[in-house]
């Protein structure tokens, strides 16, 4: 899979990092930059909703590692902790949403770096004409929910959201251009994983079944 870059990451006032990461990529989470010779202990705490807190610990003095309540084989040390203290998620799954914190204990105190990991899922976008000068744009199973806008603006029904058990959301927008002379309309889908635009030619006659949309991107 692709290596996830940290383009989206944002540092909060408390020193925690908001870290969006694309599903099916690899994520590397880093500890604070502490010299290895000053270390006593490195601990990764992994808190995922609905699961017992998992800790992965390394004690430098004895070169020992321990794990408590850690069952997910996709979450591992990047290397042996004496070589690299980073945590790797390979590949990222939708269930990896949670809080990941590295604690480094030294004789001078504890140093922390925390990540609020938000797993992103790219929605599948479809656009079709449902009836006379009415189009439906769907962003299926995205995480978080996508936003849909139209060019030109039409007479739109309230946007519908369908929430799936795995945390993804399907967003549907239906609009009508009865009194508008537009021959082509564009559905623009905004999402953290990237934006997508599709356009469709409006038929003024009878209802069509799923006129094909054209991708602008």
């Amino acid at each position: 899979g692709k290596q996830m870059t940290q383009n989206y990451s944002k540092m909060s006032a408390e020193g925690n990092i908001s870290q969006p990461v694309l599903m099916d990529t690899n994520a590397n989470l880093c500890c604070p930059p502490i010299e290895f010779r000053n270390l006593i202990v490195i601990v990764w705490e992994i808190i995922i909703r609905g699961q017992p807190s998992c800790t992965k610990a390394y004690r430098k003095e004895t070169n020992e590692t321990k794990e408590t309540n850690c069952t997910d084989k996709r979450i591992t040390w990047v290397s042996t902790p004496d070589q690299n203290s980073d945590l790797q998620i390979h590949p990222v799954a939708i269930t990896h949403d949670g809080y990941y914190r590295c604690i480094m204990a030294t004789p001078d105190g504890n140093f922390h770096r925390g990540y609020h990991l938000q797993v992103l899922v790219t929605p599948e976008v479809t656009l079709f004409q449902s009836r006379n000068r009415t189009a439906v744009c769907k962003a299926v199973a995205g995480k978080p929910a996508a936003q849909i806008s139209w060019i030109p603006a039409g007479d739109c029904a309230p946007t519908e959201h369908e929430y799936w058990g795995n945390g993804t959301v399907t967003v549907e927008s239906m609009c009508h251009w009865g009194d508008h002379n537009a021959s082509t309309v564009t559905c623009h889908v905004s999402h953290l994983t990237g934006n997508k635009s599709l356009y469709i030619k409006l038929n003024s006659g009878l209802r069509t079944s799923g006129s094909p949309a054209l991708d602008l991107l």
């Epitope: 006593i40 202990v41 601990v43 800790t55 610990a57 390394y58 004690r59 430098k60 003095e61 004895t62 020992e64 321990k66 408590t68 604690i103 204990a105 030294t106 004789p107 001078d108 105190g109 504890n110």
Partner: antibody, heavy 124, light 107 residues
């Protein structure tokens, strides 16, 4: 039951060095745990000085790092405190104690077994 | 270093009474605080660790509470053997630091 017993010189002259011994019975210090030195000054203020763990690695209080060392003699099941360039401010009761690292190696740094303490007076 | 401020320094009470001793940490130590009892001629004894967990052998009249920076040791219905010096200690991070002690005396 684990027992610890400190022994030392009692009286030391300023600028000299002294060594204290902690003898451990009921447990082999190379089998596990972390073995600390703590001192209590007149007036009751306590200061953790450092520890030696079962593998022989040491961790020292940064405020004292350059003035003392902790070593051990595994054949006698003893560990030692050597304090250099002493001054009257080092007059204290010195304790040895143990703590147990938890499953995560974090936060369980409290002392469940102590020695009775040995008084060291620094005076000319 | 995490500064530990313990109060009061002295406390006088009678057997059967309840008393509380306060310990304040200079920064957030979560629940990582221990309480010790020191008596002449005896080795120091850990009563409570992790803020509120009674160490094996500690009588149930002792209890600990607190989180973050403010902690309290409470002794309910004092027994004659409870008159001693009490210390708090943060076990959240190195260097480990202690409070200055509270001497509990018989009134």
């Amino acid at each position: 039951e684990i027992q610890l017993q400190e022994s030392g010189p009692g009286l030391v002259k300023p600028s000299q060095s002294f060594s204290l011994t902690c003898s451990v019975t009921g447990y082999t210090i190379t089998s596990g745990y972390d073995w600390s030195w703590i001192r209590k000054f007149p007036g009751n203020r306590m200061e953790w000085m450092g520890y030696i763990n079962y593998s022989g690695s040491t961790v020292y209080n940064p405020s004292l790092r350059s003035r003392f060392s902790i070593t051990r003699d595994t054949s006698k099941n003893q560990f030692f405190l050597q304090l250099n360039s002493v001054a009257s401010e080092d007059t204290a009761t010195y304790y040895c104690a143990k703590f147990e690292a938890s499953n995560t190696y974090l936060y369980d740094w409290y002392f469940d077994f102590w020695g009775p303490g040995t008084m060291v007076t620094v005076s000319s | 270093d995490v500064q530990m401020t313990q109060s009061p320094s002295y406390l006088a009470a009678s057997p059967g009474e309840s008393v509380s001793i306060s310990c304040k940490a200079g920064k957030n130590i979560n629940t990582n605080l221990a309480w010790y009892q020191a008596k002449p001629g005896k080795t120091n004894k850990v009563l409570i660790h992790s803020g509120s967990t009674l160490q094996s052998g500690t009588p149930s009249r002792f209890s600990g509470s607190g989180f973050g920076t403010d902690f309290t040791l409470t002794i309910r219905s004092l027994e004659p053997e409870d008159f001693a010096v009490y210390y708090c200690q943060q076990h959240n991070e190195f260097p480990l630091t202690f409070g200055s002690g509270t001497k509990l005396e018989i009134k």
